[in-house]
């Protein structure tokens, strides 16, 4: 999917005001420096394609995160504020039901979600003259 | 616990340059915009431009872009701004500042200040 | 560039009175619904101090006695009731529009 034609500064409010809690809550009680950051984007659409990518697609030892609140609302926000996302995505919801797993949250997860807090960042103020 | 560790005073002639330096730790130093802001007592706080760690990409306010120059060292996680050609009109506290956790665009972390004082 | 203007430059209130804080921006820094203005505390020789950021919410370690309000262009920045500590130079903030700007500062005295 192509993010170019996104919504941003909406997709930045539903963020700020919702997405952002929940993913504090999914790493409460974890150091923010326990991490070493190695996904980086350098653009709003770059970004959002690195956000969808650890949020929905299933790495070896985090197979789980599709599920979490944050995803949810991700996919919402995504699907309200990029045109056709919605559509691009019922094939990828379909497969995802198949490989259902028991949640657990992993050292991997945990490390994920601490790449999506640089990546959500990152979207939110770009050094750009993006606002 | 952030903590930004700023470089110490500085006395400089006017037209020298100044090179300051600002080390972070407590936090991933690379996936934060880190700014520099300068204070003066009559002028208040000025915005100088910031830095993005994580690839060096900068903005800068138009007032200082000719003269400022910021750089990182993602190593040492350090930032640097150098400032060109002063004049006594840049005697001030410059501070380096970490943007918050979320991209709202404040500042919740600051370094102490480096004093700089620009005199013949 | 939006300009923010800060009234009064200055003001001194009796202890345990309320202290009011005007910013006004030369144009909205509202965004979808937000409102991206902050406001900073800075006392002599220390840095300044986050107190409040998007408007209203209250920045990590800040007493209730500090409040926000406003939108669009209008903000307030209310100190009920006012502290010994609390003298020093109060600063609102945008980030809707590059470049970041402050407002030149209210520096709020005892009476």
């Known amino acids: 999917y192509d993010f170019t034609n996104c919504d941003f500064e909406k997709i930045k409010a539903a963020y700020l005001s919702t997405i952002s809690k929940d993913l504090i809550t999914y790493m409460s009680g974890t150091k923010s420096t326990e991490f070493n950051n190695t996904v980086s984007c350098s653009n709003r659409p770059h970004c959002l394609t690195e956000i969808q990518s650890l949020t929905f697609n299933p790495t070896a030892g985090c197979a789980s995160l599709a599920k979490e609140m944050f995803a949810m609302k991700t996919k919402a926000a995504l699907a309200i504020w990029c045109p056709g996302y919605s559509e691009t995505q019922i094939n990828a919801t379909q497969a995802m039901k198949k490989r259902r797993k028991r949640k657990v949250t992993t050292n991997k997860c945990l490390e994920q979600v601490s790449q999506l807090q640089g990546l959500w960042r990152r979207f939110n103020r770009p050094l750009l003259k993006q606002q | 616990q952030a903590y930004l560790q700023q470089s110490g005073a500085e006395l400089v002639r006017p037209g020298a340059s100044v090179k300051m330096s600002c080390k972070a730790s407590?936090?991933?130093?690379?996936?934060?915009?880190m700014h520099w802001v300068k204070h003066t007592p009559g002028q208040g706080l000025e915005w100088i431009g910031a830095?993005?760690?994580?690839?060096?990409?900068?903005s800068y306010n138009q007032k200082f872009k000719d003269r400022a120059t910021l750089t990182v060292d993602k190593s040492s996680r350090t930032a640097y701004m150098q400032l060109s050609s002063l004049t006594s009109e840049d005697s001030a506290v410059y501070f380096c500042?970490?943007?918050?956790?979320?991209?709202?665009?404040?500042?919740?972390?600051w370094g102490a200040g480096t004093t700089v004082t620009v005199s013949s | 560039d939006i300009v923010l203007t800060q009234s009064p430059a200055s003001l001194a209130v009796s202890l345990g009175q309320r202290a009011t804080i005007s910013c006004r921006a030369s144009e909205s820094v509202d965004n979808s619904g937000l409102s991206f203005m902050h406001w900073y505390q800075q006392k002599p020789g220390q840095p300044p101090r986050l107190l409040l950021y998007r408007a209203s919410n209250l920045g990590s370690g800040i007493p209730a006695r500090f409040s926000g309000s406003g939108s669009g262009t209008d903000f307030t920045l209310t100190l009920n009731p006012v502290e010994t500590d609390d003298v020093a130079t109060y600063y609102c903030?945008?980030?809707?529009?590059?470049?970041?700007?402050f407002g030149a500062g209210t520096k709020l005295e005892l009476k």
């Open positions: 407590g936090f991933a130093f690379t996936t934060y915009n």
């Open positions: 903030q945008q980030i809707n529009t590059d470049p970041l700007t």
């Open positions: 830095i993005y760690p994580g690839n060096g990409e900068t």
């Open positions: 500042a970490r943007e918050d956790d979320y991209g709202e665009g404040y500042f919740d972390v």
